[in-house]
Amino acid sequence: AITEAREEAKPYPLFPGPLPGSLQTDHTSLLSLPHTSGYQPALMFSPTQPGRPYTGNVAIPRVTSAGSKLLPPLAFKHTVGHIILSEHKDVKFNCSISVPNIYQDTTISWWKDGKELLGAHHAITQFYPDDEVTAIIASFSITSVQRSDNGSYICKMKINNEEIVSDPIYIEVQGLPHFTKQPESMNVTRNTAFNLTCQAVGPPEPVNIFWVQNSSRVNEQPEKSPSVLTVPGLTEMAVFSCEAHNDKGLTVSKGVQINIKAIPSPPTEVSIHNSTAHSILISWVPGFDGYSPFRNCSVQVKEVDPLSNGSVMIFNTSASPHMYQIKQLQALANYSIGVSCMNEIGWSAVSPWILASTTEGAPSVAPLNVTVFLNESRDNVDIRWMKPLTKRQAGELVGYRISHVWQSAGISKELLEEVGQNNSRAQISVQVHNATCTVRIAAVTKGGVGPFSDPVKIFIPAHGWVDHAPSSTPAPGNADPVLII
């Protein structure tokens, strides 16, 4: 049978020092001393005599000499089996045993829940020797008990490699309820049910739970722990907590905020990082996510041009990184750009629109009506063309690039010339006689070099062959022209 002692119990002395089988409660010191998990076992030295093999919890001594009486079995005396006390109180308990003086090297160790307590626990072993036996009392004290001190404590004694085990002493530390599960902050959809869980333990049990919403109790009758609160739905943010009650009093959980998911705030700080003729690189700072992760973003782009009737272009992109390269834009155009991001609830408003411009593009068409003829007297080739019909997006014409390739038996050489934008003719020196010269011309703007015109070929004869007939670009669709001289 388990003997139960409460903290009010008084020790009853039997012989000097703490009595075997007693419960000692020491309330003199309420200082919280550090808890450690160790105990230095005590050694008892007595006359040398071999022990006998271990036979369980009781050690049976061997006969001392032929025909003498057997010594009584060794066992720890019964002690209090169950100590109940409040958190932060002090406790002292012990186990005692009488050991015949024939034994040597006795060691007592303390164990809790199957694990040896090593180190600097407050354990004291006292010895009271007599003629035939020595009374050993091992005391264990804990200052300012905590819940972690709950458990089953036993003494073990080794005598000549034999082990004797005491009855367990159950320490039950009682206090205010202790939360093992508290409600968690949540982000919930408006008017949608959700659950909150609260669990607390003693001892003492039972533990009863009350729920609190925005400082008001939700349930009139308490629920036994654990408790699940089903909230049918909220329209605005609320703070929930739970109260855990037991015989010692009440503990209140942390308050948790339940947020209502909403559409995100619009992105801010939309910035232009880089513009080219046909693309704009933008970045933005995401707005508040509305208590729900961003899913994706939408970049809205519209051309700012009274003559342009183009509708908004929408480019969908991932929510991260907060950057997007808008492509397929017209050169030298102004664009209005706005960014919106969405979560599971919906789309944010579009960020305040910002203005951005693309740069000049390269010309999209080649110069027209390219003609080439040989001026033999000056030993040069005369090239003429018409200015291309460039779109405004191509920007301002800054000049032309002329490519002329000279080909004769086994030799090919390409040369490039740049001429100003006011020119519509150029002369190039004959590089090789008895060769074919192929001419192509491209318009140039700050945005780059446009496409080259179709090649025009002219044959440069050996010295003395004169022919002033020109070569020219064909009407659209014709094959490359070659002037046969």
């Epitope: 559409i263 619009p266 789309w347 203005l355």
Partner: antibody
């Protein structure tokens, strides 16, 4: 020509709600935000918020959160602003304006009078 | 919020003279080379009318006597020469970030 047509004046009782339409024409409705502006008698202009018809995203000035709700009906190119729990402080002219850099197009305004 | 402080509250200018209205932003309304400040004219019983957008761009159909300029966070609307029909209240407004805000207005009278 861009036009924003608002409804006529409204006389409403305190605590009631009112819904003001703004019908757009002359442009692609979903290409522009619709912004709303309040002007109390003899006072300056106050921006209420806007809605993007393309995606339905809304933004409100802090002062008008819970007071105004913006919606659109793309099929009729109409934007709406609902004002609820009206008090005398809400007596004002309410304008819709096509959102861009500046508000180049405005409705003619709807006078809302809150009186018992 | 960006606060726009408009001055003066009222202004009387002789016909043909210059009217100057100022608007100071509590912080920058500019980014990526553009200033998101706009000017409106409002006459009694009418909605506001956009005059200047992006600090200095004249809205289509607005007479060239209206002009806008910027110096840091200070913005100016100039009307020169002032005409009779310019008697109205003028407002500045930014669209740099939400919430958009308006200045308190300047009432222009012509003598």
């Amino acid at each position: 020509e861009v036009q924003l047509q608002q409804s006529g004046p409204e006389l409403v009782k305190p605590g009631a709600s009112v819904r003001i339409p703004c019908k757009a024409s002359g442009y692609t409705f979903s290409d522009y935000n619709m912004d709303w502006v309040k002007q109390s008698h003899g006072k300056s202009l106050e921006w209420i918020g806007n809605i993007n018809p393309n995606i339905g995203g809304t933004i409100y000035s802090q002062k008008f959160k819970g007071k105004a709700t913006l919606t659109v009906d793309k099929s009729s190119s109409t934007a709406y602003m609902e004002l609820r729990s009206l008090t005398s402080e809400d007596t004002a002219v309410y304008y819709c304006a096509r959102g861009d850099y500046g508000f180049a197009s405005w409705g003619q305004g709807t006078l809302v009078t809150v009186s018992a | 919020d960006i606060v726009l402080t408009q001055s003066p509250a009222s202004l009387t200018v002789s016909l043909g003279q210059r009217a100057t209205i100022s608007c100071r932003a509590s912080r920058s309304v500019s980014t990526s080379g553009y200033s998101y400040m706009h000017w409106y004219q409002q006459k009694p019983g009418q909605p506001p009318k956009l005059l200047i957008y992006l600090a200095s761009n004249l809205e289509s159909g607005v007479p060239a006597r209206f002009s806008g300029s910027r110096s840091g966070t200070d913005f100016t609307l100039n009307i020169h020469p002032v005409e009779e029909e310019d008697a109205a209240t003028y407002y500045c407004q930014h669209s740099r970030e939400y919430p958009f805000t308006f200045g308190s207005g300047t009432k222009l009278e012509i003598k």
